[in-house]
Amino acid sequence: ECVTQLLKDTCFEGGDITTVFTPSAKYCQVVCTYHPRCLLFTFTAESPSEDPTRWFTCVLKDSVTETLPRVNRTAAISGYSFKQCSHQISACNKDIYVDLDMKGINYNSSVAKSAQECQERCTDDVHCHFFTYATRQFPSLEHRNICLLKHTQTGTPTRITKLDKVVSGFSLKSCALSNLACIRDIFPNTVFADSNIDSVMAPDAFVCGRICTHHPGCLFFTFFSQEWPKESQRNLCLLKTSESGLPSTRIKKSKALSGFSLQSCRHSIPVFCHSSFYHDTDFLGEELDIVAAKSHEACQKLCTNAVRCQFFTYTPAQASCNEGKGKCYLKLSSNGSPTKILHGRGGISGYTLRLCKMDNECTTKIKPRIVGGTASVRGEWPWQVTLHTTSPTQRHLCGGSIIGNQWILTAAHCFYGVESPKILRVYSGILNQSEIKEDTSFFGVQEIIIHDQYKMAESGYDIALLKLETTVNYTDSQRPICLPSKGDRNVIYTDCWVTGWGYRKLRDKIQNTLQKAKIPLVTNEECQKRYRGHKITHKMICAGYREGGKDACKGDSGGPLSCKHNEVWHLVGITSWGEGCAQRERPGVYTNVVEYVDWILEKTQAV
């Protein structure tokens, strides 16, 4: 059962796993949610009746029954983890805590103009977990405007104390706001020879990389595969760090793989969700339950639905035994990973999918695309929406992309002369315009947010957000697309598609079926040569064939330029402008979405 509200003046008795320090009960709940075993917590707020050394303690708790006895205690705030909930979860914490000093290892001290600048510095520093900033009112003159970057083993403060005229806060890496590079490559036959901060068992290098990503101290990792010569180290995932933030030594070793934390990519690739099955593999751990199940998929479902289950092993039924049902072993451990991994016993193992809700919905795999042909099939581009205007009569106006359950990203120029959002309707999950009848459900638009600097498409800043009146329930036919990571600025996308219901030639009409075209990206230098009368800025991105023939056209505006990278679709561009349609040496010009990620997050995450 999902319980989100906090219980004031209440303490849960027993079940302690560990104690951490958090600046608020709300953040304690987040820490509990991300901890592999925590189901409940008790936070102690500052209070004259409480010993100051206990202020801001966050006691993480577990219970076989998923609840614990409640005791009244002033200043205690208790609650449940969000593991039991089905809604999307985020570790992003933008709060600034006034007059609190969050203690940790102060490894960097510098002058900053504001707390915001200090927070940005922390977000863009690979080691930083949180910071404390002494304001200009701080009593000690030499400490004023000092920004202290801090880290700890756990990623949370080692203590929190009251201190006048300072503010503290967390790194915004988990809000997708870091400019740090996103390095997704896994390097085969490579060992990073740096200090290990932890080690866990993992079935493959991808899981090892994801574990590294949500481990607070891990910057890179080395994984020893099951063919690694030293038997005791097989399937071992070594979580590593270094002072520079990069591996100091790379050693060539067969059957080892190494890679980097994906903390700067976490909003555009799954980092919590281990969805694969591992055949002929047994995961060992503390047994939670043994249940009969028809298949390994059914076993995974059982594990996902059991809140304490972290991973499972399924042993298929021996012929005609137990109505064809095999045994599903639901398991857990102290760190969420198997204590040992064995091969050759015939089991099929995997992980709970409960953690998938901690990943951005946009990373969910969509059904395979039909390659070739220009007409799309249902569910092929589930983020694509058709934006209709009802004035003077109802018609398709522009495309758009679902980027959140209440947010559509589109082009600013679509709203030329539009005074009110009341005339707009957003239809999602649509393949054919002919599906839209008078009684077809749509999303009303609550607000149109146009970039302040937008003047006309050709001048740039051609980007707008639509806040919907109601939330989108994600399904196979309507779900979000990932925004590109700021750390991905240097990625060269090779699998990019433009979609829309727009014209197929200059003098045409809106198409009934959603069209698609694979179009190569063009460098800005090349694009500038083709548009001498315009300024192609770094905030624009171009795509098109030299010989023309495939391009966006009238009616496609605001729609996505979607690029697939590492099996995940990213919203790389927004259809903006071009000279004619599909003309030779006239590429389409798109709003370069990565340059607006901060703006998008600022607008969509505003309180």
């Epitope: 600013a412 120029h413 709203f415 002369g417 498409a457 009616g555 505006s557």
Partner: antibody
Framework: QVTLKESGPGILQPSQTLSLTCSFS??????????VSWIRQPSGKGLEWLAH???????RFNPSLKSRLTISKDTSRDQVFLMITSVDTADSATYFC??????????WGQGTLVTVSS | DIVLTQSPASLAVSLGQRATISCRAS??????????MNWFQQKPGQPPKLLIY???NLGSGVPARFSGSGSGTDFSLNIHPMEEDDTAMYFC?????????FGGGTELEIK
């Protein structure tokens, strides 16, 4: 409601500088997207767009007149100004200011008649 | 510059009948969503009044007997049924690119 009102010298001599003021109310030139244009119309003829100033002080000019035009604003007093240097009889016209947000010219002033005569 | 050519230069239409005014642009005034073509009505001694924006959208408070159509380079303004009050000059105007330009105008009167 939105109103715009032009004012000018009425009559001036060739080679002089024409100074026009557009005083407006009902909107602010601090609002992103907002802008004001000057448009003129010689008697019995068509309309000619001259210049535009945006909320952020970015300016656009008709290239055929650019060297003679200066557009500016005083946001606190809700006024926009246009200066045309070295006027000629061909500059005799009714001068309009019009509001342009992120869309068409929706609101216009009544216009001020300017006659260039020696 | 984008040149707008209006036709006819003058037009007389009977009350209750349809008036059609054309406007041709020297190059396309469309982008990937919008036709940046507007229509204005001007009566003697008055400023222009917005009738149609983005080729087919009715301006605020404009009667439904006015309608606009077209895309690319060819646009038209329709008035049906023609009323006494519609006697005026009509101008097309493009907002696609600076310099923003106007057509030469069409004088509409009652036959």
């Amino acid at each position: 409601q939105v109103t715009l009102k032009e004012s000018g010298p009425g009559i001036l001599q060739p080679s002089q500088t024409l100074s026009l003021t557009c005083s407006f109310s009902g909107f602010s030139l601090n609002t992103p997207g907002m802008g004001v244009s000057w448009i003129r119309q010689p008697s019995g003829k068509g309309l000619e767009w001259l210049a535009h100033i945006y909320w952020d002080d970015d300016k656009r000019f008709n290239p055929s007149l650019k060297s003679r035009l200066t557009i500016s604003k005083d946001t606190s007093r809700d006024q926009v100004f246009l200066m045309i240097t070295s006027v000629d009889t061909a500059d005799s016209a009714t001068y309009f200011c019009a509001r342009k947000g992120r869309g068409p010219f929706t609101y216009w002033g009544q216009g001020t008649l300017v006659t260039v005569s020696s | 510059d984008i040149v707008l050519t209006q036709s006819p230069a003058s037009l007389a239409v009977s009350l209750g009948q349809r008036a059609t005014i054309s406007c041709r642009a020297s190059e396309s005034v469309d982008n990937y969503a919008i036709s940046f073509m507007n229509w204005f009505q001007q009566k003697p001694g008055q400023p222009p009044k917005l009738l149609i924006y983005a080729a087919s959208n009715l301006g605020s408070g404009v009667p439904a007997r006015f309608s606009g159509s077209g895309s690319g380079t060819d646009f038209s303004l329709n008035i049906h049924p023609m009323e006494e009050d519609d006697t005026a000059m009509y101008f097309c105007q493009q907002d696609k690119e600076v310099p923003w330009t106007f057509g030469g105008g069409t004088e509409l009167e009652i036959k």
